[in-house]
Interface confidence: low
């Protein structure tokens, strides 16, 4: 496929990803795949810098990313490694807790309204950030 | 420019109560997270307590859970720090301080009220 | 709980002088450490957050550095201001701990 060298419209360009912020509300797996479709992925945050730049865009706005725990330990989408990389859980969290009454535990991470991260119910509605990467290969056929 | 001002220390036998006040301006205090810190005379620093910027979620160091409470009001832009049941090495200066919105750090501190528990 | 240990205790030396501190965490706390500077009878101020990052108008001359366990803050020149007592904090869960502190006199 052809290399992607400038961001989407209505995408933001910062450190050579771009970003898309949703203003609606859709379910973690809904969103993931909303990403997909757009030929990106749920973000992936691997600093504090990136962290900070999401943190802006998002507000304090309950938002879906690229982190679960689904299939027992946490993983990052994009399949960056989880336990050497950036983190920024609330202090106590993730507890994966079953006291919300809505079955199973949480195991879906979120930025919180003060940016730190929650994990909670996979299935409530919060809005999500999509990222990709740019100068990677698009998913496109080249235009013959 | 942000303020944090402490009031309500002073001199409480062993045994009794005192309500600390941390009185905020400059910033927007319903966005963020407060803390208070307390030093004894000549010692380190030592972290109380924290409350969320909504009041949702408080925690406390050992030595004083079930004996202090914080609290906030956000409509008055004031922290506070009930403290029941003072002993005498409650002792210290008490600061509040805020909390960046990223991580628990703390990126503007008050002056400090001094408590001195002794009979 | 996560234990700060800082070393030393205290220092002297000399303006001009290059003075590291260094901090350990009892586990692993990753970026998750802070460093203030006190002066007798004031509050704390924040010198550094996240390990390495300068907070906003502290001189360049301060600056740190490690993650994981192993954390040190350094002052490439000392300056007469800069005589204090300098803390780490960890910030990765509660209840957040502070090192014992680095009082850094004039020699």
């Known amino acids: 496929g052809s290399e992607r060298t400038c961001c989407p419209v209505n995408w933001v360009e910062h450190e050579r990803s771009c970003y898309w912020f949703s203003r609606s509300g859709k379910a973690w797996a809904d969103a993931d795949n909303y990403c997909r479709l757009e030929d990106a992925h749920l973000v992936v945050v691997t600093s504090w810098e990136e962290q900070k730049f999401v943190q802006h865009h998002i507000g304090p706005v309950n938002t879906w990313m690229g982190l679960h725990d689904q299939n027992g330990p946490w993983k990052w989408v994009d399949g960056t490694d989880y336990e050497t990389g950036f983190k920024n859980w609330r202090p106590e969290q993730p507890d994966d807790w079953y006291g919300h009454g809505l079955g199973g535990g949480e195991d879906c991470a979120h930025f919180t309204d003060d940016g730190r991260w929650n994990d909670d119910v996979c299935q409530r509605p919060y809005r999500w950030v999509c990222e990709t990467e740019l100068d990677k290969a698009s998913q496109e056929p080249p235009l013959l | 420019q942000v303020q944090l001002v402490e009031s309500g220390g002073g001199v409480v036998q062993p045994g009794r109560s005192l309500r600390l006040s941390c009185a905020a301006s400059?910033?927007?205090?319903?966005?963020?997270?407060m803390h208070w810190v307390r030093q004894a005379p000549g010692k380190g620093l030592e972290w109380v307590a924290v409350?969320?910027?909504?009041?949702?979620?408080?925690y406390y160091v050992d030595s004083v859970k079930g004996r202090f409470t914080i609290s906030r009001d956000n409509s008055k832009n004031t922290l506070y720090l009930q403290m029941n049941s003072l002993r005498a090495e409650d002792t210290a200066v008490y600061y509040c301080?805020?909390?960046?919105?990223?991580?628990?750090?703390?990126?503007?501190w008050g002056q400090g009220t001094l408590v001195t528990v002794s009979s | 709980d996560i234990q700060m240990t800082q070393s030393p205790s205290s220092l002297s030396a000399s303006v001009g002088d290059r003075v590291t501190i260094t901090c350990r965490a009892s586990q692993n706390i990753y970026s998750y450490l802070n460093w203030y500077q006190q002066k007798p009878g004031k509050d704390p101020k924040l010198l550094i957050y996240a390990a390495s990052s300068l907070h906003s108008g502290v001189p360049s001359r301060f600056s740190g550095s490690g993650s994981g366990t192993d954390f040190t803050l350094t002052i490439s020149s000392l300056q007469p201001e800069d005589f204090a007592t300098y803390y780490c904090?960890?910030?990765?869960?509660?209840?957040?701990?502070f090192g014992g502190g680095t009082k850094v006199e004039i020699k």
């Open positions: 409350i969320w910027h909504d009041g949702s979620n408080k």
């Open positions: 904090q960890q910030s990765y869960s509660t209840p957040l701990t």
């Open positions: 400059g910033f927007t205090f319903s966005y963020y997270g």
């Open positions: 301080a805020r909390e960046n919105s990223s991580s628990y750090y703390f990126d503007y």
